[in-house]
Amino acid sequence: APRGTQAEESPFVGNPGNITGARGLTGTLRCQLQVQGEPPEVHWLRDGQILELADSTQTQVPLGEDEQDDWIVVSQLRITSLQLSDTGQYQCLVFLGHQTFVSQPGYVGLEGLPYFLEEPEDRTVAANTPFNLSCQAQGPPEPVDLLWLQDAVPLATAPGHGPQRSLHVPGLNKTSSFSCEAHNAKGVTTSRTATITVLPQQPRNLHLVSRQPTELEVAWTPGLSGIYPLTHCTLQAVLSDDGMGIQAGEPDPPEEPLTSQASVPPHQLRLGSLHPHTPYHIRVACTSSQGPSSWTHWLPVETPEGVPLGPPENISATRNGSQAFVHWQEPRAPLQGTLLGYRLAYQGQDTPEVLMDIGLRQEVTLELQGDGSVSNLTVCVAAYTAAGDGPWSLPVPLEAWRPGQAQPVHQLVKEPSTPAFSWPWW
């Protein structure tokens, strides 16, 4: 660090004074020197180091007519917003010829009310759930003692006697405010007031009660909500593609969820208008006057298969001697599951009904008994899934086939009631 030499008398006729004050203070240090000839540039030192970017001014006043006469030089250093880093010993420095001169030191100190480095923040917490709040303050002067207040009531008998930087709260059952006071020899500073909003706990044990192809009934156990009754719960369901990848804790589904509200109690909800035989993910959150709980994790569920909702379409049945040829198309109505096959039933006027499982084929040739003289033969077809048979088609009469004639096609409507057949007995 530059040092003044004693070979010549110091040119300084005014030295920096002292400033002590609170953070944010605007202050000015001054030094004055009298020199002969060209006035030098005045530099400022803090703790022996030159301040390269000092906010300083310089005035030069000649004391005579000639440039070689004496000059008075005044330099002022501005401290705009006093911080801890500004404190220290300040001096002016000039280079005159081959010599360096430094003024007597002035001192800048920080002393005032405590200053908060950290204050309690607003937050939401679940009812009866532990959490921590932070507060940190410094002087000078030190020491700084903290006093926590909850709803404006001190949590200790005196500053410094209770928790200091961190306040552990074992749980709240109502929305509360917290602040901290910082005390030092200069007085007291009060932090901002943090509002801790008590929300319901996350619901637990979300589970399926019953399943239908297009609806699921779900139930859950509500969490504690403090002094605030639950007003409703919200259930979300989202289609889960195999590759969708909703993880247990993933915050949001990849598509817009189906949202339903449930009055509570009971903590149960029937989710309708779902697709059969479809995987979903569901979650629930419950709300009080203070706001909603966090969502439960996504629960994978699946609607069961249903039976097809309509009969096969465009059934045609033609007879040629002792053979009957029957074909049809897949039902237009929703299958509500995976199509496993078709059942076919045929019956004559005075003969017992014959029931066949055709599998996934959409045509069959029937070998009729005897000479084929069975009268008024009719055929019915139904599609089935793992959940059972769909509705049977209306009976289609077997028509005699004549060469050169197109096979007749019957447009059939849905059978209102399904015949009760047992499993094939053949």
Epitope: G24, L25, T26
Partner: antibody, heavy 121, light 107 residues
């Protein structure tokens, strides 16, 4: 004799720009901080900003930060206030003022001892 | 920012009266307070700096006092040329802020 003379005021549309000048005489601009203060019609005084002409450092009120720029030319002994993106609420008489320099070794705060006559924007 | 609250906002007085204007800071500003006088259509004039120091050329009937948050400007014997608006200003922190002004009128 110490004197500050403002010029450059006038009528301008919202969103427009204006440059005010503050010509100093009787003292060197390098030796003090120069402040700009404004006064809306029938209202009180509002500080706009200051400049250290010797270093070129400027400091602004939040209400003008990013829109106004204070500069100085020590060779012309003149300070400037460049006002851009002007708003209706910037309507005022604008004064430049010299900061009073005491002769003690230190001081806390400051006062403004010489003021210009003001220019209406 | 520090708020400076002046009172009263206006007062009526007669020549020769003793007039007191007060200014309260929203937080401690030590002695970093100045007082100015402004007449209509004119620039402000410095009267007092550092709370209690009389600026050069200002008549001695003007005086200032106070420290911390409460400050006072006193005119010991009001003269005809003293009818004007008076402003306090703190410069302890930046930005400096002014009081809203006190208008001294002739009774």
């Amino acid at each position: 004799e110490v004197q500050l003379v403002e010029s450059g005021g006038g009528l301008v549309q919202p969103g427009g720009s204006l440059r005010l000048s503050c010509a100093a005489s009787g003292f060197s601009l390098s030796g003090s901080w120069i402040h700009w203060v404004r006064q809306a019609p029938g209202k009180g005084l509002e500080w706009v900003g200051w400049i250290n002409p010797y270093r070129g450092y400027a400091y602004y009120a939040d209400s003008v930060k990013g829109r106004f720029t204070i500069s100085a030319d020590t060779s012309k002994n003149t300070a400037y206030l460049q006002m851009n993106s002007l708003r209706a609420e910037d309507t005022a008489v604008y004064y430049c003022a010299r900061e009073y320099s005491g002769w003690g070794g230190s001081s806390v705060g400051y006062a403004m001892d010489y003021w210009g006559q003001g220019t209406l924007v | 920012d520090i708020q400076m609250t002046q009172s009263p906002s206006s007062l009526s007085a007669s020549v020769g009266d003793r007039v007191t204007i007060t200014c309260r800071a929203s937080q401690d500003v030590s002695t970093a307070v100045a007082w100015y006088q402004q007449k209509p259509g004119k620039a402000p004039k410095l009267l007092i700096y550092s709370a209690s120091f009389l600026y050069s050329g200002v008549p001695s009937r003007f005086s200032g006092s106070g420290s911390g948050t409460d400050f006072t400007l006193t005119i010991s014997s009001l003269q005809p040329e003293d009818f004007a608006t008076y402003y306090c200003q703190q410069s302890y922190t930046t930005p400096p802020t002014f009081g809203q002004g006190t208008k001294v009128e002739i009774k």
